[in-house]
């Protein structure tokens, strides 16, 4: 059988090879499609309800004003010339539908280093056959699954038009110390060959590179945190991170009701103010980051070291912030 | 929403003439064939005529051939019916229906419209 | 020309029944077949096209059937608004031919 592809909606003939070019002609086509069960046979003659979708013409031909999916499928004629001798022709018909240009919607305007980011979603309308969605980084093709590429993919079909909706979601993890502005593009490729490519204008996202996290710092002085009844505590909570963050300060795991300071006076200890110390900084852009945790103690007088199992009340007693 | 609204019947004696309209809106109108079905008082539906998207084409039952004359303007979405040598037998409600080939039969209707044949 | 041979041409049955309309084609018209329904006074309604498939907006108790040239409309529980006059068509070859119709009535 030969090969046609047609595009939807755009007129086709079929010429019935061996047919004499006027009537009176002894032909007959007989079409085996979507629209038939079986085989449906078409004569010069006919003329009806399948006149919308093909008719004979009076050169014998097969005329289908406008082809759609259902036509897809098995066209044969039958003739006989004038010595009656029989010729017969044999089609294939595939059709097709380019959709319109490939759209990136969603895309994000910018991308962090190191992790997953959703790029954007690159839709397909309106092709037939589906067809297939590729993503391209900076000019070369992304392989899903490789180096923190990942593509959600999706195919819809338009309940009367019978056409192609395509999704395609890309997710990268960009490299640190990478491209600052890489050059992200999507192309539908037809599922019929010898259609060219369609890509999408560009889009192209800053990748922001975020700065790792230096440690905070909580400086006791005295050094050990051990200090005799009546004495003064001074924790310091050191942050490099520029701006300053934000410092709260914890007790034995629970947040102290003071305003944000970086440093913490306990002036005058008691017994109540025996426990664990531990700063918060909270950073805009980071969440909050909370240091290690110091033990205060009270030394009796005579004592080498804190004294064992000496743990305060709840009470905070008198607390100066610096 | 699609619409059909057909128009002109009335009472005519036998032999003369009627022309029948029939308003289309909501679809596109040149996309499809359109056809005229009829159905006396009291009986069943009976094909009447049909036209091609294009206009190009007309088909007729044996029973209104050269009597009738079905045509459309897609310029003013609009089709049409004309009835010459009336006989007692046309009388019917006369509807007007989209399609009419095989891509989808007769999908949607008008109210239909009375046509009388009497002296 | 196609005849359409619509049976029974009546017939009466009571809410929840299940009802069988059938039309035998003279010839074979494939799958290009509907079925209408019809009140008095009121146009046709689309209910069935090509054969099995229901059009858009009718309930799911009326279903369409095919073997060979007999095209079958069934209605699994009559309703009340389902007494009314019921047509096949056939749109494979002109002339374009209805059955006869089959009026259910309320028993």
């Known amino acids: 059988a030969q090969n046609i592809t047609a595009r939807i909606g755009e007129p086709l003939v079929l010429k019935c090879k061996g047919a004499p070019k006027k009537p009176p002609q002894r032909l007959e086509w007989k079409l085996n499609t979507g629209r038939t069960e079986a085989w449906k046979v078409l004569s010069p003659q006919g003329g009806g309800p399948w006149d919308s979708v093909a008719r004979v013409l009076p050169n014998g031909s097969l005329f289908l004003p406008a082809v759609g999916i259902q036509d897809e499928g098995i066209f044969r004629c039958q003739a006989m010339n004038r010595n009656g001798k029989e010729t017969k022709s044999n089609y294939r018909v595939r059709v097709y539908q380019i959709p319109g240009k490939p759209e990136i919607v969603d895309s994000a305007s910018e991308l962090t280093a190191g992790v997953p980011n959703k790029v954007g979603t690159c839709v397909s309308e309106g092709s037939y056959p589906a067809g297939t969605l590729s993503w391209h980084l900076d000019g070369k093709p992304l392989v899903p699954n490789e180096k923190g590429v990942s593509v959600k993919e999706q195919t819809r079909r338009h309940p009367e038009t019978g056409l192609f909706t395509l999704q395609s979601e890309l997710m990268v993890t960009p490299a640190r110390g990478g491209d600052p502005r890489p050059t992200f593009s999507c192309s539908f490729s037809p599922g019929l060959p010898r259609h060219r490519a369609l890509r999408t204008a560009p889009i192209q996202p800053r990748v922001w590179e975020p700065v790792p996290l230096e440690e905070v710092q909580l400086v006791v002085e005295p050094e050990g945190g051990a200090v005799a009844p009546g004495g003064t505590v001074t924790l310091t909570c050191e942050v490099p991170a520029q701006p300053s963050p934000q410092i709260h300060w914890m007790k034995d795991g629970v947040p102290l009701p003071l305003p944000p300071s970086p440093v913490l006076i306990l002036p005058e200890i008691g017994p109540q103010d025996q426990g664990t110390y531990s700063c918060v900084a909270t950073h805009s852009s980071h969440g909050p980051q909370e240091s290690r945790a110091v033990s205060i103690s009270i030394i009796e007088p005579g004592e080498e070291g804190p004294t064992a199992g000496s743990v305060g009340g709840s009470g905070l007693g008198t607390l100066a912030l610096a | 929403e699609v619409q059909l609204v057909e128009s002109g019947g009335g009472l005519v004696q036998p032999g003369g003439s009627l022309r029948l309209s029939c308003a289309a809106s909501?679809?596109?109108?040149?996309?499809?064939?359109m056809t005229w079905v009829r159905q006396a008082p009291g009986k069943g539906l009976e094909w009447v005529a049909s036209i091609d998207n294009s206009g190009d084409n007309t088909y007729y039952p044996d029973s209104v051939k050269d009597r009738f004359t079905i045509s459309r303007d897609n310029a003013k979405n609009s089709l049409y019916l004309q009835m010459n040598s009336l006989r007692a037998e046309d009388t019917a409600v006369y509807y007007c229906a989209r399609g009419g080939d095989i891509r989808e039969g007769l999908r949607y209707w008008g109210q239909g419209t009375l046509v009388t044949v009497s002296s | 020309d196609i005849q359409m041979t619509q049976s029974p041409s009546s017939l009466s049955a009571s809410v929840g029944d299940r009802v069988t309309i059938t039309c035998r084609a003279s010839q074979d018209v494939g799958i290009y077949v509907n079925w209408f329904q019809q009140k008095p006074g009121k146009a046709p309604r689309r209910l069935i096209y090509?054969?099995?498939n229901l059009a858009d907006g009718v309930p799911s108790r009326f279903s369409g059937s095919r073997s060979g040239t007999d095209f079958t409309l069934t209605i699994s529980s009559l309703q009340p608004e389902d007494f009314a006059t019921y047509y096949c068509?056939?749109?494979?070859?002109?002339?374009?031919?209805f059955g006869g119709g089959t009026k259910v009535e309320i028993k």
């Open positions: 909501g679809f596109t109108f040149n996309n499809y064939w």
């Open positions: 090509r054969a099995t």
């Open positions: 068509l056939e749109f494979d070859e002109h002339p374009l031919t």
